[in-house]
Amino acid sequence: VLHYVVCFPALTEGYVGALHENRHGSAVQIRRRKASGDPYWAYSGAYGPEHWVTSSVSCGGRHQSPIDILDQYARVGEEYQELQLDGFDNESSNKTWMKNTGKTVAILLKDDYFVSGAGLPGRFKAEKVEFHWGHSNGSAGSEHSINGRRFPVEMQIFFYNPDDFDSFQTAISENRIIGAMAIFFQVSPRDNSALDPIIHGLKGVVHHEKETFLDPFVLRDLLPASLGSYYRYTGSLTTPPCSEIVEWIVFRRPVPISYHQLEAFYSIFTTEQQDHVKSVEYLRNNFRPQQRLHDRVVSKSAVRDSWNHDMTDFLENPLGTEASKVCSSPPIHMKVQPLNQTALQVSWSQPETIYHPPIMNYMISYSWTKNEDEKEKTFTKDSDKDLKATISHVSPDSLYLFRVQAVCRNDMRSDFSQTMLFQANTTRI
């Protein structure tokens, strides 16, 4: 018997029935990965970040991104003055489109957006926008951080020098300097209307490889209100091939986004293949772990008064956000294996990042459906190192969903792990 496992992260109530619909219907499409010359990589598992270096040597370099920016060690660089933006205030054309790449959601820019200044060697043209986000409820999803503080979403805009290259891809393939801006999104109580075209677009690219044209938006409105306070350092692409060719501009001030708008990011799917198990998963936690600074220096802009009245409380007070209630990233490497006809073993690995250590125990929740009834049980594994649990009295004709959550001191919790769906006696796909 081949056990067919589909991984889904945690959803809302009523989810089990919806999942049944997907399994027996065709709402969730399982796609085979297209044959391609690029090495396969993922954000976790056997092809995760720690393994990227095996197929992309640069990923093991000394000038990698992302990084944590410690403000107190960033030196003011007099050469880092006001950014000059050209075309950013124009509405985008109807040819601008969004794609679910399976690793991120990308906006392919079809209009002329230029940036210069900030120590960039020339006038750079914007090529695309990519997003990185967390798991749920505003949990940490940004790649960069400031003083250890991560944000729910990081938007990255990539630029190349059109005077030197005919395309962005040529600049990458020839290992030449490109520019990138990192913009943090932070939870706020109200919707940010400037994001509406993006959020609307996300709903059109829920599934892997989907594409959609975007309603007009103003790129400048997706940037922080004040652009004067930014950090500069030289780093890399944060995905394979991890080329060390990126001049990073990381804006200190975030852009607001509501919980409601964040949900559009958390609703994006991808497809993965681990071993012989094909899975449809939510695309979440699509960020690379942070890299060492090594011999690099981070600089900060010298724009007059730009660092005054800055959101220092906002950045340094960890009590002010929902994300701060999360004590770690989710438990990872969830596996469900049958022990015998009536017992399953759930295993997992410790979260990659623990914001408020140590983990004291783990909560295992599992639910199942039988005869259209839904039941749920939760129990505590009172250990931080024996990361497996046995579920007894398993019914072979029930559909089981498992998820694990770390519990830290003060009863703080991690995000939930992926929800693993398990049913025996299913057919091969």
Partner: antibody, heavy 115, light 111 residues
Framework: AQSLEEFGGRLATPGTPLTLTCTAS????????MSWVRQAPGKGLEWIGT?????DAYYASWAKGRFTISRTSTTVDLKMTSLATEDTATYFC???????????WGPGTLVTISS | SFVLTQPASVQVNLGQTVSLTCTAD??????ASWYQQKPGQAPVLLIY???SRPSGVPDRFSGSSSGNTATLTISGAQAGDEADYYC?????????????FGGGTQLTVTG
């Protein structure tokens, strides 16, 4: 190099309140859980308490009520009340790292309680 | 509360291997850390999470854990290893978190 230093240790009489202060160099205190550990002369190490990154504090059962740990972005304080001769010890400020261990220790500050 | 038990003293010949033990009911489900303290100095972290060694600690020091016992092994003992060695762990949940040190083992290197 990353280091910690404790201040405030002195000779005091029983019942006197005392506050010890810890400062860091080479890293930001605000991003770590910080603890206080003490060692009486010729004795072993004794955990007093820990303050987490959110300001949540945890204490050894014997320390509750008499010892209070607080923090700012640049210091971690240990307030001690109702001190007795058996509280004579070297008090260490320590950084909690790796989730489960104390990786940086201050040199310690000696508190002597004597009448 | 819980107690970590360590032998009060252990002797080892120069160049030999010695194992220091730490036992407690909680150690089957909790990680142990190990510290070295020389007279008049602050302790130094040797091992965390049972087996991990911080950078700068010689690989002569290794940690292991089995059941309710955590073990610190020093191979090729040197005169400079003469010190007190403490194990520690934490337990509890919610707001009842506790951290406990063992009573310490005084290691004497002879020869």
């Amino acid at each position: 190099a990353q280091s910690l230093e404790e201040f405030g240790g002195r000779l005091a009489t029983p019942g006197t309140p005392l506050t010890l202060t810890c400062t860091a160099s080479g890293f930001s205190l605000g991003t770590y859980s910080m603890s206080w550990v003490r060692q009486a002369p010729g004795k072993g190490l004794e955990w007093i308490g820990t303050i987490g990154g959110r300001g949540d504090a945890y204490y050894a059962s014997w320390a509750k009520g008499r010892f209070t740990i607080s923090r700012t972005s640049t210091t971690v304080d240990l307030k001690m009340t109702s001190l007795a001769t058996e509280d004579t010890a070297t008090y260490f400020c320590v950084r909690e790292n790796y989730g489960y261990a104390f990786d940086i220790w201050g040199p310690g500050t000696l508190v002597t309680i004597s009448s | 509360s819980f107690v970590l038990t360590q032998p009060a003293s252990v002797q080892v010949n120069l160049g030999q291997t010695v194992s220091l033990t730490c036992t407690a009911d909680t150690l089957s489900r909790r990680y142990a850390s190990w510290y070295q303290q020389k007279p008049g100095q602050a302790p130094v972290l040797l091992i965390y999470r049972d087996t991990s060694r911080p950078s700068g600690v010689p690989d002569r020091f290794s940690g292991s854990s089995s059941g309710n016992t955590a073990t610190l092994t020093i191979s090729g003992a040197q005169a400079g290893d003469e010190a007190d060695y403490y194990c520690a762990t934490s337990d509890g949940s919610g707001s009842s978190y506790q951290c406990v040190f063992g009573g310490g083992t005084q290691l004497t290197v002879t020869g």
